[in-house]
Amino acid sequence: MRRGPRSLRGRDAPAPTPCVPAECFDLLVRHCVACALLRTPRPKPAGASSPAPRTALQPQE
């Protein structure tokens, strides 16, 4: 049984993730997690100290 592609990659898109489609790749911790648990870093505004909101992109099949 052939394993399907895990992600689609555009010219400037990030490298394909090692996650199965049921999970998302968390760029902060560099591994796959449930998509509800993502904690991907965003640039902080000056003087900000609170943790970044949970956002990230999940490649689809």
Epitope: M1, R3, P18, V20, C32, A34, C35, A36
Partner: antibody, heavy 118, light 113 residues
């Protein structure tokens, strides 16, 4: 063809231990996440956890309801993965299924029955 | 944990009838970044193991007859069987895989009159 075959079920006393096996064929075992799910007689399904693939270092996730008592592992050389169950209780009596995880729980084995009773 | 609630718990229909069953989650299963709903439907026939029917709430698994349709988004989902066949006698479960622990609904038992 994907095939998953569970074994190792049986009768065990409360407080005892049991190791279930899931023999895998039809796909590259190192390239897939594998999960365990159980179903008490006449009741709904309960997800127990899964073990990720080689690309993810075979890391695991567990249902808090069994974390600390149940351990998922794999022997890739023999295309088998395991569910080690310790300190078993009457409420652990169920049919235990292994399943391949991809889009969801894509393929399931036929199940093996565990009965915990004195 | 996300609680999955299915209704009705059972229903009896005649062959050829249309059936709808509901699944509600205690929180949204929609991931805004890709607009996917992390919800699956399974069919468990008597004495058999579950079989994946639908994933992403509405995508039919390969080989599943097109009389099975999944719909819905966010917290409310529906499985529809457009024209029931005798072989559809089973319990149908929904399951979320948006977060851990993955959780299942209590099931809807479909009986044939």
């Amino acid at each position: 063809e994907v095939k998953l075959v569970e074994s190792g079920g049986g009768l065990v006393q409360p407080g005892g231990s049991l190791r279930l096996s899931c023999a895998i064929s039809g796909f590259t075992v190192t390239a897939y996440y594998m999960s365990w799910v159980r179903q008490p007689p006449g009741k709904a399904l309960e997800w127990l956890g899964f073990i990720r693939d080689k690309a993810n270092g075979y890391t695991t996730e567990y249902n808090p309801s069994v974390k600390g008592r149940f351990t998922i592992s794999r022997d890739n050389s023999q295309s088998i993965f395991y569910l080690q169950m310790n300190t078993l209780r009457a409420e652990d009596s169920a049919t235990y299924y292994c399943a391949q995880v991809r889009r969801a729980l894509d393929y399931w084995g036929q199940g093996t029955t565990v009965t915990v009773s004195a | 944990d996300i609680v999955m609630s299915q209704s009705p718990s059972s229903l009896a229909v005649s062959v050829g009838e249309k059936v709808t069953m509901s699944c509600k989650s205690s929180q949204s299963l929609l991931y805004s970044s890709n607009q996917n709903n992390y919800l699956a439907w399974y069919q468990q026939k008597p004495g058999q193991s579950p079989k994946l029917l639908i994933y992403w709430a509405s995508t039919r698994e390969s080989g599943v007859p097109d009389r099975f349709t999944g719909s819905g988004s966010g917290t409310d989902f529906t499985l529809t069987i457009s024209s029931v066949k005798a072989e559809d006698l089973a319990v149908y479960y929904c399951q979320q895989y948006y977060t851990y622990p993955y959780t299942f609904g209590g099931g809807t038992k479909l009986e044939i009159k």
